[in-house]
């Protein structure tokens, strides 16, 4: 399903035609809107008796929920109306139309204030946790563009000082669950995620507790994308690694691109003692190079039996017709000198070139500094 099919309708009723059977239409409505779902009979024939279902349960008509054979209206929608809706034939239960509905607030960005809401002595002898800034917790839905930084905050107090933990979609959420990692700032009662991507969408719950009680708050994160968009990268942590001579090292990079990206692992190198070419751009060697047909690619560079010469800066780079994204990784190798130094295993190794975007291909043999285009992606003739 293309990313362009999602619609956002705020502040007015919107009628949406039903998708083909088997497809799921993803729809976003603003809080307070009238959600209107339309499911015309397939092929224009008679519809027969139908039933509308939300999250597996039949919808009961009310003053707010208006049910017809081909149309469902939910007036004054709220977050609780989000879910999976389907229109089914009453007798066979065959799904005629299927919709995924999200009811959101207007897009907003995270609270970016630092250094506030630190744990403070409230003077209370003992007590269960409570929110110290409940007015700052009204934004329960955060809709941010991809690649932005998101911060969720749950400023609280209690005696003894409560602990805070985080859940994603009801499960414990730790840094290793997300390729770019997370930052937990306990003093600020916050969770920070940098460079958000579509897989970060979900419900984030802070759980604040001490021996006298527990309170929790759930935020919903929606990551908004434009289609097409420049590749988005999440670099696996740690970005800087120190390895012992002879050990194995792996760098990890996640690439999101809705337009076939050309993905490369590169390493900065020296040529004749120089790190940059005559035009000032760095020399790099292509370690791996390929085109990804998927929207989401988990790419890894494995360096086996590392030697001192493997130390240095590595780049994960993704290019599509809109633009380029890249992340740098540093490797330091220490220990006794290896008897024999091994080269990196690579799909396509050995091309050294100067230039931020230079890939040596048939078109580039003239020596001009050229950009990667989709044509370059099709044939890699490295020299």
């Amino acid at each position: 399903e293309s990313l362009g099919t999602e619609q956002r309708v705020v502040g007015r009723a919107a009628e949406v035609p039903g998708p083909e059977p088997g497809q799921q239409e993803q729809l976003v409505f603003g809080s307070g809107d009238a959600v209107e779902l339309s499911c015309p009979p397939p092929g224009g024939g008679p519809m027969g008796p139908t039933v509308w279902v939300k999250d597996g349960t039949g919808l009961v008509p009310s003053e707010r929920v208006l049910v017809g054979p081909q149309r469902l209206q939910v007036l004054n929608a709220s977050h609780e109306d989000s879910g999976a809706y389907s229109c089914r034939q009453r007798l066979t239960q065959r799904v005629l139309c299927h919709f995924s509905v999200r009811v959101t607030d207007a897009p907003s960005s995270g609270d970016d204030e630092d250094g506030e809401d630190e744990a403070e002595d409230t003077g209370v002898d003992t007590g269960a946790p409570y929110w110290t800034r409940p007015e700052r917790m009204d934004k329960k839905l955060l809709a941010v563009p991809a690649a932005n930084t998101v911060r969720f905050r749950c400023p609280a107090a209690g005696n003894p000082t409560p602990s805070i933990s985080w859940l994603k979609n009801g499960r414990e959420f730790r840094g290793e669950h997300r390729i770019g990692g997370i930052k937990l700032r306990h003093q600020q009662w916050s969770l920070v995620m940098e460079s958000v991507v579509p897989s970060d969408r979900g419900n984030y719950t802070c759980v604040v507790e001490n021996k006298f009680g527990s309170i929790r708050q759930t935020y919903t994160l929606d990551v908004l994308e434009r289609s097409p968009h420049r590749p988005i990268l999440q670099a696996g942590l740690p970005a800087n690694q120190t390895a012992v001579l002879g050990s194995d090292v792996e760098f990890h990079c996640k690439v999101y691109s809705d337009a076939q990206p050309h993905i490369q692992w590169l390493k900065h190198v020296e040529v004749n003692g120089s790190k940059v070419g005559p035009d000032g751009t760095p020399y790099v060697t292509v370690l791996k190079s390929w085109i990804s047909e998927s929207v989401e690619a988990d790419v890894r560079l494995r360096l086996a039996n590392v030697s001192e010469r493997d130390g240095g800066e590595y780049l994960c780079r993704a290019t599509n017709f809109i633009g380029v994204a890249e992340k740098a990784f540093w490797l330091s190798v220490h220990g006794p000198r290896a008897a024999e130094e091994e080269l990196v295993e690579a799909d396509e190794a050995g091309s050294v070139y100067a230039g931020e975007q230079k890939l040596i291909s048939e078109e580039d043999l003239g020596g001009e500094q050229k950009l990667i285009s989709e044509e370059d992606l099709h044939h890699h003739h490295h020299h």
Partner: antibody, heavy 115, light 108 residues
Framework: QVQLQESGPGLVKPSETLSLTCTVS????????WSWIRQLPGKELEWIGH???????RYNPSLQSRVTISIDTSKNQFSLKLSSVTAADTAVYYC?????????WGQGTLVTVSS | EIVLTQSPGTLSLSPGERATLSCRTS???????LAWYQQKPGQAPRLLIY???RRATGIPDRFSGSGSGTDFTLTISRLEPEDFVVYYC?????????FGQGTKLEIK
Amino acid sequence: QVQLQESGPGLVKPSETLSLTCTVSGDSINSYFWSWIRQLPGKELEWIGHIYSSGSTRYNPSLQSRVTISIDTSKNQFSLKLSSVTAADTAVYYCARGASAVDYWGQGTLVTVSS
Amino acid sequence: EIVLTQSPGTLSLSPGERATLSCRTSQSISSGYLAWYQQKPGQAPRLLIYGASRRATGIPDRFSGSGSGTDFTLTISRLEPEDFVVYYCQQYGSSPYTFGQGTKLEIK
């Protein structure tokens, strides 16, 4: 929302150099590809070339000997120069975001080559 | 260079009908590097489809793209009055990136 605006003279004499500038607003010019495309009087579209924010370029081979695309990231602008123009270069010139396929376009500027 | 041929040159249909626009390339285009644009009079083209079948943001779902190799299709499932304009296909797999000559969609 990204917006692109072409600027430059609407009339150029034969054999002279056509110069246009595209100003990008709403986003940084960095890390993106930027193109020039023209639409000839018969309505056919022709890709002229593109530039990356680093300054690397690629041109249409049919125009390569006459075309130069440059970029000024400090001003969020990129430019087109087409030398030795003839009446056949009369067209609406568009600047756009993207290397090949493009998602944002300027509104276009008509350049007439005439003495 | 790769030549793109669009057919028909002009397509006459009524609102509510289904439109099928064809684009053939003189050489196979790998990885579906084909885009479709819509151009209204006096305006710049607007990207509808890229990657042969991906809809750009804000494009109604009545527009869909399909095809691979040398044969590509833009389908408009239910024509609206504002859809009666010119459509171009473009290949961006091989430089120079080239466009078709356009298909004009007119009201019958």
